[in-house]
Amino acid sequence: ATKLTEEKYELKEGQTLDVKCDYTLEKFASSQKAWQIIRDGEMPKTLACTERPSKNSHPVQVGRIILEDYHDHGLLRVRMVNLQVEDSGLYQCVIYQPPKEPHMLFDRIRLVVTKGFSGTPGSNENSTQNVYKIPPTTTKALCPLYTSPRTVTQAPPKSTADVSTPDSEINLTNVTDIIRVPVFN
């Protein structure tokens, strides 16, 4: 079974979260995708979404969030720039497929943003404050407002044991180590 993992990214204020979610190219290439935050006990809240239909490698900016859907590669790129401590939380990518419920993508992202700015340029890739130049023509896409009760999610279990969900053949695994992007070893 595929494992739905949670990756932890630890960044400083002012830095950029730069992640990707992959999807089945043949099924979802032009589907509308969204970036959501999941707060304990609440419905996932959509923060930004691509256009409908999603345009290939066309950046969409909503505040400090930039989405770029490479549907010739089956990848949604998500950037959150100029991170703030209050951005800390659990995030996920989903694909809207009305009237069906949103389809959740791998992986969930546990973002931890801390105060202060570590290091000088050259000490760590994270220490660079990338200034992303987004064309002024980028659009703010309208996101569907509906949410489904089945998209309400619980925090991952404290143990490292897999929690089986037979209907979807997905296991939820608690990943406890921290990623200080990029991690290659």
């Epitope: 595929t2 992640v19 490698s57 791998f106 890739e125 660079t128 992007v181 290659f184 070893n185």
Partner: antibody, heavy 122, light 107 residues
Framework: QVQLVQSGAEVTKPGASVKVSCKAS????????INWVRQATGQGLEWMGW????????GSVQKFRGRVTMTRNTSITTVYMELSSLRSDDTAVYYC???????????????WGQGTMVTVSS | DIQMTQSPSSLSASVGDRVTITCQAS??????LNWYQQKPGKAPKLLIY???TLETGVPSRFSGSGSGTDFTFTISSLQPEDIATYYC?????????FGGGTKVEIK
Amino acid sequence: QVQLVQSGAEVTKPGASVKVSCKASGYTFTRYDINWVRQATGQGLEWMGWMNPNSGNSGSVQKFRGRVTMTRNTSITTVYMELSSLRSDDTAVYYCARGGISSSWHWAFDIWGQGTMVTVSS
Amino acid sequence: DIQMTQSPSSLSASVGDRVTITCQASQDINNHLNWYQQKPGKAPKLLIYGAYTLETGVPSRFSGSGSGTDFTFTISSLQPEDIATYYCQQYDKLPLTFGGGTKVEIK
């Protein structure tokens, strides 16, 4: 130690297919993308595409689309790249390379297979 | 696609020399650039990622700098074992693209 070991050299005819394997060891296989890069003799490096061994999803460069298929077998921590409708200009060394954590946009290839020479000749 | 132009395509230098290779992107790629070393008959090896971060275990004589469209790779004191071809690679946009390579030889 962390390594990628590829299958041996192949000689094949135009129009045929070739399937190259890449066995990963020494790390959590499902956590890192595997990429494929090829290099014709005396030429530069050309990225072909990527695969997420956890989800099984993959993507490839436009020029290979429809000809390349990437699959994996998680039980034996192996990724496969099949290239079909081979032409003489597909003659090259094919490398698998580990990318970053699957959720990260940081595409640096830190571990490489030894390469598989594929010769397409009639 | 983003084009990566490396120069020179080849160079010859003496042991101990400072060697500089440049890589120019056809558009702004922020700091999303990696450098690789490839010795004859071998697979490439990652040296630098994120424009200037040295990969673990790579000697400190190798360094990288730059941001935007212009990047530089430097070997501060060329050693005999540095004979290889060096490639830059961008990852700001898909598809990922490599420079044409710079072949470094010893005089």
